[in-house]
Amino acid sequence: PPRGRILGGREAEAHARPYMASVQLNGAHLCGGVLVAEQWVLSAAHCLEDAADGKVQVLLGAHSLSQPEPSKRLYDVLRAVPHPDSQPDTIDHDLLLLQLSEKATLGPAVRPLPWQRVDRDVAPGTLCDVAGWGIVNHAGRRPDSLQHVLLPVLDRATCNRRTHHDGAITERLMCAESNRRDSCKGDSGGPLVCGGVLEGVVTSGSRVCGNRKKPGIYTRVASYAAWIDSVLA
C-alpha cells in the first residue's frame, strides 16, 4: 500500500509546489519526494525497503496522479542512494537520494527547492508546509490530487516527553504538531517547507497519525548537508 497521508489538510493549489515529487513503485504512488537538484530527488530511505524487485520511478510536475497534465513527466531512476547509516528498525538517518535517468526538464511546474544548510533548529511555532498524496482520512481514502497542511513546529523537549516520543528525537530530527492535522507514513519522503526553504523530510517510521501526543517526525536536512553535497557532487 502507498506509504502516505495528509490528515486535516486541503487540496493544494495546482503546481504551486513545483519541487514536489511522487516516488512510484510499479506505477503506483509509494512516497513523497522533493526535487533538490536538476537530476536528484530527496526522499526517505525506508520508502524503498520493500521495493527490491519493483520498478522505481519518479513523477514530477504533477498535481493529479491520474489525469493528463502538460507538465507531468515520469522519470526512471538511475541510482538510489540511501543514507549509509539508515536501518530498517530506526527512524534515524531516514534519507534517500534518487538520481534521475536524466536532468529534469525545468519549468513553472518543475523546479528544485532550496534546502537549508545552516544547522540550526527551526523556532518552535514556525508554520511549515507539508504536502503529499497519501490517504486523507482514517478510512483510508486516497486522494488523486496533491494535498497539503500547514503545521507549527514543536520544540524538541516537548516532542521527547515520555508521553510523546520518549527521547527518540535526536538533534538530527524535528517535530511538528499532529493534532488531527498531520502528515503520516506515505507522505514519507515528502518535504517540510518553512519560509520557502526545505527544512525537513517526512520520516517513514510507523506511528499513529493525527494524535497530538505523537507529533510528526521529520529528518532535518541541514544536519545532513555534508552527505547530500557529497552524493550530488
Epitope: G8, A12, A16, G125, L127, P152, R180, R181, G195
Partner: antibody
Framework: QVQLKESGPGLVAPSQSLSITCTVS????????VDWIRQSPGKGLEWLGV???????NYNSALKSRLSISKDNSKSQVFLKMNSLQTDDTAMYYC?????????????WGTGTTVTVSS | DIQMTQTTSSLSASLGDRVTISCRAS??????LNWYQQKPDGTVKLLIY???RLHSGVPSRFSGSGSGTDYSLTISNLEPEDIATYYC?????????FGSGTKLEIK
C-alpha cells in the same frame, strides 16, 4: 454570501468567565478554520486562537491557560470561552474565517462584539 | 513572539495622493505578511495577502511589497473611502501578530 456574527454578554464582572458565540453562514465549519481576535480600546489587534475544520486548536501562548475554543459544526457555531477576566480583557472581540491554502489569512471578519469587564 | 512595528501611527494625505504605509518584523518572515483595513465603524477587511497578492474585490490602487523584515502597503490614488486604519499581520510563526496600526486621514 460568507458571514460571521459574534454574540456575547456585553458586560462581565472581574474574575468571571466570558462566553462568546460566532455563528457563521455561507461556508462549512468542517472546511475552514475560525479564529478569534480582539482589540482593546485604543489598541491594536491581538490574535487569541483558532479552531480548524478538523476540530484541532491553536492558542496564543500568552492566554492559553484561560482560553478554550470549541464548535458545533451542525449548528455552524464556534464558541470562545475565557476564564478569570480582568479589566484589561475589555475589548471588541472578533471572529474571522481562516483560509489555510497555499497562503494563510483571515478573509472574512465578523462585525465584532463589545465586552466590558467591570464590577 | 514576532513583533510587528508600524512606526507611523497616523498619516495625513490629500485625495489623489500616493500613500505608503510601512511595517517591520522583528525577524525574517519570508513574505508571510497580510494587510487589513479597519474602517472607523470597526469593520475589518483583508486587502493583501502574502505580501503582494490582492484579495478578490479589492481595488487595484492597493498594492503591497517587501521582503525579509521590511514590508509596505501602497495606495496609489487616495479616495475618500480609504479613510481607515491599516494593520499588517505576520503568519510566519505562531502566535500570529499584528502591527499597531496606521491611521490614515484626509488633509
Amino acid at each position: 454570501q460568507v458571514q460571521l456574527k459574534e454574540s456575547g454578554p456585553g458586560l462581565v464582572a472581574p474574575s468571571q468567565s466570558l462566553s462568546i458565540t460566532c455563528t457563521v453562514s455561507g461556508f462549512s465549519l468542517t472546511s475552514y478554520g475560525v479564529d478569534w481576535i480582539r482589540q482593546s480600546p485604543g489598541k491594536g489587534l491581538e490574535w487569541l486562537g483558532v479552531i480548524w475544520g478538523v476540530g484541532s486548536t491553536n492558542y496564543n501562548s500568552a492566554l492559553k491557560s484561560r482560553l478554550s475554543i470549541s464548535k458545533d459544526n451542525s449548528k455552524s457555531q464556534v464558541f470562545l470561552k475565557m476564564n478569570s477576566l480582568q479589566t484589561d480583557d475589555t475589548a471588541m472581540y472578533y471572529c474571522a474565517r481562516s483560509y489555510d491554502g497555499s497562503y494563510w489569512y483571515f478573509d472574512v471578519w465578523g462585525t465584532g462584539t463589545t465586552v466590558t469587564v467591570s464590577s | 513572539d514576532i513583533q510587528m512595528t508600524q512606526t507611523t501611527s497616523s498619516l495625513s494625505a490629500s485625495l489623489g495622493d500616493r500613500v505608503t504605509i510601512s511595517c517591520r518584523a522583528s525577524q525574517v518572515i519570508s513574505n508571510y505578511l497580510n494587510w487589513y483595513q479597519q474602517k472607523p465603524d470597526g469593520t475589518v477587511k483583508l486587502l493583501i495577502y502574502y505580501t503582494s497578492r490582492l484579495h478578490s474585490g479589492v481595488p487595484s490602487r492597493f498594492s503591497g511589497s517587501g521582503s525579509g523584515t521590511d514590508y509596505s502597503l501602497t495606495i496609489s490614488n487616495l479616495e475618500p473611502e480609504d479613510i481607515a486604519t491599516y494593520y499588517c499581520q505576520q503568519y510566519s510563526k505562531l502566535p500570529y501578530t499584528f502591527g499597531s496600526g496606521t491611521k490614515l486621514e484626509i488633509k
